[in-house]
C-alpha cells in the first residue's frame, strides 16, 4: 500500500487521467459481495433500480454484475490493478443499459440508465487489496470509494492509507 502523501499525489492524478480507448479491454460477469459476505442485489422498483446489501438465504441465486475493464493512461501503482503498467478503471452494470454511478453530492451510489460513451461518474479505479478483495475508487472524486453504510452502498471518503483496508470498502468478486 502507499503512504498518505502517495495517496494524495496518486488521487490528484486521477482527475486528469483519461481512458486510453473507448472500448473495454475485457469484461467479467461476477457476483459482488461485501467483505463480510453479504450480497449486493438489485431490484426493479417503480421503473428504477434499487441497490441492497443483504444476507441471502441458502441456495438463493446471487445477482450478477458485468465489470468492464478500461485502461487509463495514468500509470498504475502498487495498490491499483494494472495491465502493461497502466491503471485499470471499471464500470459496473447489473443489467443491460444500466450502470452504477457515483453521486458525489449525495454521497450515494445509484443505478442510471445511459448510453455510451459513459459519463465519468460511471468509472471507478480498481484496487486489488488483500484476501482477494477489491475496492472501487471514484474517478470523479479521488479518495472516495464505494462502501457499505446502513445496508446500502454509499460513497465513503478515505483520507489515509490505513483506511484503504477498512472492511466497509472491500468487496469480493465471484463467479457463483
Amino acid at each position: 500500500a502507499f503512504g498518505i502523501s502517495g495517496v494524495q499525489k496518486y488521487t490528484r492524478a486521477l482527475h486528469d487521467s483519461s481512458i486510453t480507448g473507448i472500448s473495454p479491454i475485457t469484461e467479467y460477469l461476477a457476483s459482488l459481495s461485501t467483505y463480510n459476505d453479504q450480497s449486493i442485489t438489485f431490484a426493479l422498483e417503480d421503473e428504477s433500480y434499487e441497490i441492497y446489501v443483504e444476507d441471502l438465504k441458502k441456495d438463493e441465486k446471487k445477482d450478477k454484475v458485468l465489470l468492464s475493464y478500461y485502461e487509463s493512461q495514468h500509470p498504475s501503482n502498487e495498490s491499483g490493478d494494472g495491465v502493461d503498467g497502466k491503471m485499470l478503471m471499471v464500470t459496473l452494470s447489473p443489467t443491460k443499459d444500466f450502470w452504477l454511478h457515483a453521486n458525489n453530492k449525495e454521497h450515494s451510489v445509484e443505478l442510471h440508465k445511459c448510453e455510451k460513451p459513459l459519463p465519468d461518474q460511471a468509472f471507478f479505479v480498481l484496487h486489488n487489496m488483500h484476501s482477494n478483495c477489491v475496492s472501487f475508487e471514484c474517478k470523479t472524486d479521488p479518495g472516495v470509494f464505494i462502501g457499505v453504510k446502513d445496508n446500502h452502498l454509499a460513497l465513503i471518503k478515505v483520507d489515509s492509507s490505513e483506511n484503504l483496508c477498512t472492511e466497509n470498502i472491500l468487496f469480493k468478486l465471484s463467479e457463483t
Epitope: I22, S23, P24, T26, E27, Y28, L29, Y69, T95, K96
Partner: antibody
C-alpha cells in the same frame, strides 16, 4: 513480459486425439482479468477460433467444434490445454494459444473474444 | 454467425504510401467490437487495433482504425518496409467470433 508457448506432438493419426498445452510465463493465469484461448490456421488459410477459458475453468467453445473440444486449465502449473478428439486431415493446422479479452453481449448472454498476446504457434499434422 | 469480407484481397503499394483496408460485416453490430491483426509469414498474428479504433499497446500511430455498423477500415498512413504483411479483421460482438479472409499488403 507475458509470453505463451505451445507444446505437444506434431503428428497425430486420424481418429485419435490431439492434445496441446500452453505454458504462460511472465504473468499469472490466476491473477489475470483476461481469458485464455486456442486459435488455429490451416495451411495457406485464415484463422479459426477454437475456444476460450477463464482461470476458474469456465469454458466457451466454437459451436462448429464444440462436440470434439475440451479446454482445461491448471493454475498450479500456469498452463491451459486443448484436447480435440476424432481428428481428420481437416484438423491439420498451426495451433496458437493466446491471451484474450472477453466481451459480453447482453442480447444473447454470451461472451466473445479478441486475442491480444499470442504464442508462436505449433504445427500439427494429421496423417497415418 | 457474422461473416466478414475483406477487400481488396491484395494491395500492391510502395513504402511511404497510404494503405486503406476494408472489412465489411454481413450483419450490423452496435458495439464496435472489431479487431485488426497483422501476420507476417511464419509468425503468429499480432493485435493492432481493438474496439474498432483503439490501438493496442506498442502499436505505432501510423496504424488507425475506424468505422461502425457494417463497415470498418484499417488505415496505415505511411507504409514502412516492415508493414508488408497479411491483415485480418475479426468481430467479437457476437459468439462465435469470426475472422475475415485477410488482405495481403505487398510491395509494388
Amino acid at each position: 513480459e507475458l509470453q505463451l508457448q505451445e507444446s505437444g506432438p506434431g503428428l497425430v493419426k486420424p481418429s485419435e486425439t490431439l492434445s496441446l498445452t500452453c505454458t504462460v510465463s511472465g504473468g499469472s493465469i490466476r491473477s489475470s482479468i483476461f481469458y485464455w484461448g486456442w486459435i488455429r490456421q490451416p495451411p495457406g488459410k485464415g484463422l479459426e477460433w477454437i475456444g476460450s477459458i477463464y482461470y476458474s475453468g469456465r469454458t466457451y467453445y466454437n459451436p462448429s467444434l464444440k462436440s470434439r473440444v475440451t479446454i482445461s486449465v491448471d493454475t498450479s502449473k500456469n498452463q491451459f490445454s486443448l484436447m480435440l478428439t476424432s481428428v481428420t486431415a481437416a484438423d491439420t493446422a498451426v495451433y496458437y494459444c493466446a491471451r484474450a479479452g472477453g466481451l459480453y453481449n447482453w442480447n444473447d448472454e454470451s461472451f466473445s473474444f479478441y486475442m491480444d498476446v499470442w504464442g508462436q504457434g505449433t504445427t500439427v499434422t494429421v496423417s497415418s | 454467425e457474422i461473416v466478414l469480407t475483406q477487400s481488396p484481397g491484395t494491395l500492391s503499394l510502395s513504402p511511404g504510401e497510404r494503405a486503406t483496408l476494408s472489412c465489411r460485416a454481413s450483419q450490423s453490430f452496435s458495439s464496435s467490437y472489431l479487431a485488426w491483426y497483422q501476420q507476417k509469414p511464419g509468425q503468429a498474428p499480432r493485435l493492432l487495433i481493438y474496439g474498432a479504433s483503439s490501438r493496442a499497446t506498442g502499436i505505432p500511430d501510423r496504424f488507425s482504425g475506424s468505422g461502425s455498423g457494417t463497415d470498418f477500415t484499417l488505415t496505415i498512413s505511411r507504409l514502412e518496409p516492415e508493414d508488408f504483411a497479411v491483415y485480418y479483421c475479426q468481430q467479437y460482438d457476437r459468439s462465435p467470433l469470426t475472422f475475415g479472409g485477410g488482405t495481403k499488403v505487398e510491395i509494388k
